[in-house]
């Protein structure tokens, strides 16, 4: 499914003010000692990932047990493991309490900017999509993904941070922007809305899609997320739509199927590991890009967001369960977590293809009014 | 010291039974997913079954799916592998194995224990 | 027959360096998987030699390294040393038969 070229579709903005952004990307992992070297991390020592930071929660320091030896993913070792294989998890484990940033929520007090100065950034994100406006750049080439293809064992930690659906990514999953711009992948996490309610954050011409998928890495040239926040590519989320097809999404049953053992907050499940490329369009030479942020606090800036041209298919119970299962705090249902677009600033949002050429018969002569920024660097 | 130590081998007759366990010692037993793989005589290495951390899942191989069952008991750092229906050609060194580890495969092997089917 | 192929035997004189290949298909190796290698000397358990397609664990000689490439793997020893002399084998995931397989394995002779 290729994005449509939608109606200004008034926004659903789902009960998200303009700064629900939950914590920068959702969770991302806190500080965890290292495991001993004879005890690599075991599949159950996956860290929830529940908490990577802002895009639904950002690491905080905290020390854990050797026994648990589960190093986090902004501890990865190098290639060559000087010791028994250790296993170094995206460990996302913090201590709620303690972090100023996990006290918000979508909507109403308090205000994101309180919980963080970021959230009133200039640049953040999510925002509205205009092909027409978007600026062809032949420098973007296809999206590179290396180890996204997970055996069943070890099982990876799906949980129910409060804002959104986590699941937890074991370390070895690379992913290219292009030359040089190498990521690993920390976490996936959804976006959605409520019945008859769409839940996307980006939006396409005003038309907000049923639900986003944000797979969230950082740059190998950062060994933590802490010091990769707030720095120009230091984070990179890929993102795509989901849409309502007629048939069931089996890569993506695989995790909602098991939804209702974790409908509590805060509950987590362990889940086999799955094909996570199968979670995404199958298209990776056609996508937007732009520089935003976290859609969560702490909504840390220089964020590469690339938004999938090419929708995924998920068919009406799958969406359905999805926006109906889950329980956010306070006794509500976990539904439109989403953050309300933000406004470019003047940031240009750049496409892989001339995504301004309408294929309809019927278009107009196209008019690209922005030009590519990048020049392949 | 990390260590998988095995015990339960042995003579059986074809259609027999037999329990093999595989004590684990000094890491966080239940966490970690664990394995059975078996070696023929003169033969290569042959992956039995599977068990995530919490014992919830499990997986077999063709050959004996259906026969054997993996379980594991995280409360004595204990994992077992019960083989019913017991063949000729199920005769082999039977290892336990900690893993599959996030990307390290089969990271700890026990000694091994030989199970021989024959009348 | 093995999933994934390594010929029978591979000789070689001390000092000398050797690979020992391993071919999968589209549904383990090329797929994606990881794939480890695992040292059997005579009488013993396996141990694992690399991890991961080209990691050494700790307390492995630099002279073992590895690589990966499409639908298969190659393990290389340089420098042979006498006490290399065992059997090697490649293991992977393969999602079509939802198994962890292993190579058919590779004796090792140092002449």
């Known amino acids: 499914q290729r994005l449509p070229r939608m109606q200004e579709d008034s926004p659903l903005g789902g009960g998200s003010s303009g700064e629900d952004d939950p914590l920068g990307e959702e969770d991302l992992p806190s500080e965890e000692d290292s495991p001993r070297e004879e005890d690599p991390p075991g599949e159950e020592d996956l860290p929830g990932e529940e908490d990577l930071p802002g895009e639904e929660d950002l690491p905080e320091v905290k020390p854990k047990s050797e026994e648990e030896g589960s190093l986090k993913l902004e501890d990865l070792p190098t290639v060559e493991a000087p010791g028994d294989p250790q296993e170094p998890q995206n460990n996302a484990h913090r201590d709620k309490e303690g972090d100023d940033q996990s006290h918000w929520r979508y909507g109403g007090d308090p205000p994101w900017p309180r919980v963080s100065p970021a959230c009133a950034g200039r640049f953040q994100s999510p925002v509205d999509i205009r092909p027409q406006l978007a600026a062809f750049c032949p420098a973007l080439r296809p999206l590179e993904l290396l180890g996204f293809q997970l055996p069943p064992l070890p099982e990876l930690r799906l949980r129910n941070n409060g804002h959104s659906v986590q699941l937890t990514l074991p370390p070895g999953l690379e992913m290219a922007l292009g030359p040089g711009r190498e990521y690993r992948a920390l976490q996936l996490h959804l976006h959605w809305g409520a019945a008859g309610r769409p839940g996307s954050e980006h939006t396409v011409e005003g038309h907000r899609f049923p639900a986003e998928i944000h797979v969230v890495h950082l740059s190998t040239a950062f060994a933590r997320v802490d010091e990769a926040l707030g720095r120009p590519g230091g984070l990179a989320v890929l993102a795509a739509f989901l849409e309502e097809g007629p048939e069931e999404n089996s890569a993506y049953e695989q995790l909602l199927s098991r939804l209702e053992e974790i409908a509590e907050e805060g509950s987590e499940t362990q889940v086999p590991g799955l094909d996570i490329s199968a979670l995404l369009p199958s298209d990776f030479s056609r996508y937007f890009q732009y520089e935003g942020s976290l859609t969560t606090p702490p909504c840390a800036q220089g964020v590469i967001w690339t938004v999938f041209n090419q929708t995924v298919m998920l068919s009406a119970k799958q969406l359905h369960t999805l926006s109906d299962t889950l329980w956010g705090p306070g006794d509500s249902r976990l539904q439109l977590n989403f953050r309300a677009t933000q406004p470019l600033n003047g940031r240009v949002i750049e496409a892989s293809f001339p995504a301004g050429v309408d294929s309809s018969p019927r278009a107009a002569e196209p008019v690209q009014l922005n030009s590519c920024l990048a020049a392949g660097d | 010291q990390v260590q998988l130590v095995q015990s339960g081998g042995g003579l059986v007759q074809p259609g027999g039974s037999l329990r093999l366990s595989c004590a684990a010692s000094e890491f966080t037993f239940g966490t970690y997913a664990m394995t059975w793989v078996r070696q023929a005589p003169g033969k290569g290495l042959e992956w039995v079954s599977a068990v995530s951390g919490s014992g919830g899942s499990t997986y077999y191989a063709d050959s004996v799916k259906g026969r054997f069952t993996i379980s594991r008991d995280n409360s004595r750092n204990t994992l077992y592998l019960q083989m019913n229906s017991l063949r000729a050609d199920d005769t082999a060194v039977y290892y336990c194995?900690?893993?599959?580890?996030?990307?390290?495969?089969?990271?700890?092997w026990g000694q091994g224990t030989m199970v021989t089917v024959s009348s | 027959q093995s999933v994934l192929t390594q010929p029978p035997s591979v000789s070689g004189a001390p000092g000398q360096r050797i690979t020992i290949s391993c071919t999968g298909s589209r549904s383990n190796i090329g797929a994606d998987y990881d794939v480890h290698w695992y040292q059997q000397l005579p009488g013993t358990a396996p141990k694992l030699l690399i991890y991961?397609?080209?990691n050494r664990p700790s307390g492995v000689p630099g002279r073992f390294s590895a690589s990966k490439s499409g639908t298969s793997a190659s393990l290389a020893i340089s420098g042979l040393q006498a006490e290399d002399e065992a059997d090697y084998y490649c293991q992977s995931y393969d999602s079509s038969l939802r198994a962890w397989v292993f190579g058919g394995g590779t004796k090792l002779a140092v002449l």
């Open positions: 194995a900690r893993g599959p580890v996030l990307r390290y495969g089969f990271d700890i």
């Open positions: 991961a397609n080209n």
